[in-house]
Interface confidence: medium
């Protein structure tokens, strides 16, 4: 129904906390650069304002839209153009046009310094002084830091993050408590992140129809005993919801977020028997429940999927009255069946059987012609489950940071034209898929690692995207998403590229190594390794384990010496000879 | 039991409208999908729109996009087909369903309404 003033129902319905901890994250996403004081005053601004279209919808601009109101007030920011050069541009725009602008200026790679952590004891006293503040910082640094965070789900982060600080805060031994329970939500939302970022990219390039069939196949595996009917409602409300929040409605989006929670909760019945636990939690944690949900059991007694998509005379009938619908349920009715597949294979089988139904139902045998289509899914299903097979296997071999460094030099023959530092992002995530998906049962593992890759290569095609350096990830990038695993997957070692020169300085390292942490030793480590294959892409593994080995042995030597600085200055020189030699 | 009872049919002229209803009861209507299917003489069942429990989202056959608006009452069980712009190869008994899961089979249909577009 339509309100008079949007800003006022959105208040209404948000409540004023997570109405605040929202407009942060739409301001912190759209001006990435400017601190958190100048984003905090313009929250206060607009929360202020909102108060008064509350207490009267018919005060001065509370009839206006929100992309209205927030496009405003980023626009009167003093020296806009100084710090954000062409997007101070959109503000010349009219709304929607001016929105669209701002979208187009989200930076996937920011240049922002990686988020630090500060010590335990700092941080538990900041927190205790001003919890309002410290979450607020919290919202604002992940928000700028991932311009396409689902703002619904960063809120129940910052909630986790205040359970975690309460509970922590008042141990003897804060550190301890505080690490491993933070280290686990960041590594859920930066998990959560690059899932977001696949979804928006996914609405961006192919629109909501490629979107919902991702929801259908999502839905239909999660809540097998739903009807068709139910399915798509949800899907067609997931849609709504995703496009809102990719759009920058982050109001609109939580708002609906919560709704759909409450319609799931209310109609439990028709939807699954799963549901129960999440509908007694309160809103951020119920949806967060509800969509991360266990799947439903399967129906017993589900028929043959031959028997309507396949043996049935009326199949092309049926596809020529209504294709989307038809396609729909073949989609439902196939993903139900197979919790134990990817949302990326189900599409692809989805994809094969439109296109067989495409050209038998134009056939004057059709049924002759369709009549196999379910056997050749069969290598489309297998190559996924080798997939599965190899990387697990390399991973319970290698573990996940020799699993990375496997990953590191394959992808860096793949595309040696790509940044050193994008080349070890994008494999140190591929790599933890090991750790993530190898060690889950046999049923669980494929949905878990086609799923996770195809985010993970998601995100290196955004980044790619910006500055395109190789042909063969734009090729791969430019595809269906659903097929850009498997071009990923397929690519070989770069014929067309022309080695790097072997620079000494490239190789060249202090004793500045020695104390830090080991995820930055190990990224010091990955980013050499890279170099070199991109020196010589052909080496072989076992050149590259000499050379690495070699290196490994030659920082952690440097690292126990008493001079560390001359052990790095006349020792260096040498690994890389040995190095240059080995490689020869 | 369930029951469905379709009105609403009748002789209608080339480009002009209708409105067909469907009282429902001896089941919970407002949890289950519904709807309308048509037969046209000497043909099979034909799938014309389907209408989700809550009212959103629905879905029409290709051949009647644009035309037909499905709508539902949950307070009165009742559920309705607003035709406009009828053609000749409308003609056909309109019955209302009961919408399953399977595809676009149904559980149980009325004894139907008969909607003829004729000059």
């Known amino acids: 129904e339509a309100h008079k003033s949007e800003i006022a129902h959105r208040f209404k319905d948000l409540g004023e906390q997570h109405f605040k901890g929202l407009v942060l994250i739409a301001f912190s996403q759209y001006l990435q650069k400017c601190p958190y004081e100048e984003h905090i005053k313009l929250v206060q601004e607009v929360t202020d304002f909102a108060k008064t279209c509350v207490a009267d919808e018919n005060a001065e601009n509370c009839d206006k839209s929100i992309h209205t109101l927030f496009g405003d007030k980023l626009c009167a920011i003093p020296k806009l153009r100084d710090n954000y050069g062409e997007l101070a541009d959109c503000c010349a725009k009219q709304e929607p046009e001016r929105n669209e602008c701002f979208l187009q200026h989200k930076d996937d790679n920011p240049n922002l310094p990686p988020f630090q952590r500060p010590e335990a004891e700092a941080m538990c006293t900041s927190f205790q002084e001003n919890p309002t503040s410290f979450l607020g910082h919290y919202l604002h640094e992940v928000a700028r830091r991932h311009p396409y965070f689902y703002a619904p789900e960063l809120l129940y982060y910052a909630e986790k993050y205040n359970e975690v600080l309460t509970q922590c805060c008042t141990e003897s031994d804060k550190a301890a408590c505080l690490t491993p329970k933070l280290d686990a939500v960041k590594e859920k939302a930066l998990v959560a992140a690059v899932r977001q970022r696949m979804k928006c990219s996914s609405m961006q390039r192919f629109g909501e129809r490629a979107f919902k069939a991702w929801a259908v196949a999502r839905m239909s595996q999660r809540f097998p005993n739903a009807e068709f009917a139910e399915i798509t409602k949800l899907a067609t409300d997931v849609t709504k919801i995703n496009k809102e929040c990719c759009h920058g409605d982050l109001l609109e989006c939580a708002d609906d977020r919560a709704e759909l929670a409450k319609y799931m909760c209310e109609n439990q019945a028709t939807i699954s028997s799963k549901l129960q636990a999440c509908c007694d939690k309160p809103v951020l944690q119920k949806s967060q429940c509800l969509a991360e949900i266990e799947h439903d059991n399967i129906p017993a007694d589900l028929p043959s999927i031959a028997a309507d998509f396949v043996e049935d005379k009326e199949v092309c009938k049926n596809y020529a009255e209504a294709k989307d619908v038809f396609l729909g349920t073949f989609l439902y009715e196939y993903s139900r069946r197979h919790p134990d597949y990817s949302v990326s294979l189900l599409l692809r089988l989805a994809k094969k059987y439109e296109a067989t139904l495409e050209k038998c139902c134009a056939e004057g045998d059709p049924p002759a012609c369709y009549g196999t289509v379910l056997a050749e899914f069969q290598p489309l299903v297998e190559e996924p489950k080798n997939l599965v097979k190899t990387n697990c296997e390399l991973y319970e071999k290698l573990g996940e940071y020799g699993f990375q460094n496997a990953v590191l030099v394959r992808y860096t023959q793949k595309a040696p034209q790509v940044s050193t530092p994008t080349l070890v992002e994008a494999a140190r995530n591929l790599g933890r898929v090991g750790t993530k998906c190898c060690t889950l049962p046999e049923a669980q593992r494929l949905p878990c690692v086609e799923d996770y890759l195809s985010a993970i290569l998601n995100r290196l095609c955004v980044l790619h995207e910006k500055t395109p350096v190789s042909e063969k990830v734009t090729k791969c990038c430019s595809g269906s998403l659903v097929e850009r695993r498997p071009c990923f997957s397929a690519l070989t070692v770069d014929e067309t590229y022309v080695p790097k020169e072997f620079k000494a300085e490239t190789f060249t390292f202090h004793s500045d190594i020695c104390t830090l942490p080991d995820k930055e030793k190990q990224i010091k480590k990955q980013t050499a390794l890279a170099e070199l294959v991109k020196h010589k892409p052909k080496a072989t593994e076992d050149q590259l384990k000499t050379v690495m080995g070699d290196f490994a042995q030659f920082v952690d030597k440097c690292c126990k010496a008493a001079d560390k600085d001359n052990c790095f200055a006349t020792e260096g020189p040498n690994l890389v000879a040995r190095s240059k030699e080995a490689l020869a | 039991e369930v029951q469905l009872l379709e009105s609403g049919g009748g002789l209608v002229q080339p480009g002009g409208s209708l409105r067909l209803s469907c009282a429902a009861s001896?089941?919970?209507?407002?949890?289950?999908?519904m709807l309308w299917v048509r037969q046209a003489p000497g043909k099979g069942l034909e799938w014309v729109s389907v209408?989700?429990?809550?009212?959103?989202?629905?879905y029409y056959a290709d051949s009647v996009k644009g035309r037909f608006t499905i709508s539902r009452d949950n307070s009165k069980n009742t559920l309705y087909l607003q035709m406009n712009s009828l053609r000749a190869e409308d003609t056909a008994v309109y019955y209302c369903?009961?919408?399953?899961?399977?595809?676009?089979?149904?559980?149980?249909r009325g004894q139907g309404t008969l909607v003829t577009v004729s000059s």
């Open positions: 369903a009961k919408f399953p899961s399977r595809k676009m089979k149904f559980d149980y």
């Open positions: 001896g089941f919970t209507f407002d949890t289950s999908s």
């Open positions: 209408i989700h429990q809550s009212g959103t989202p629905t």
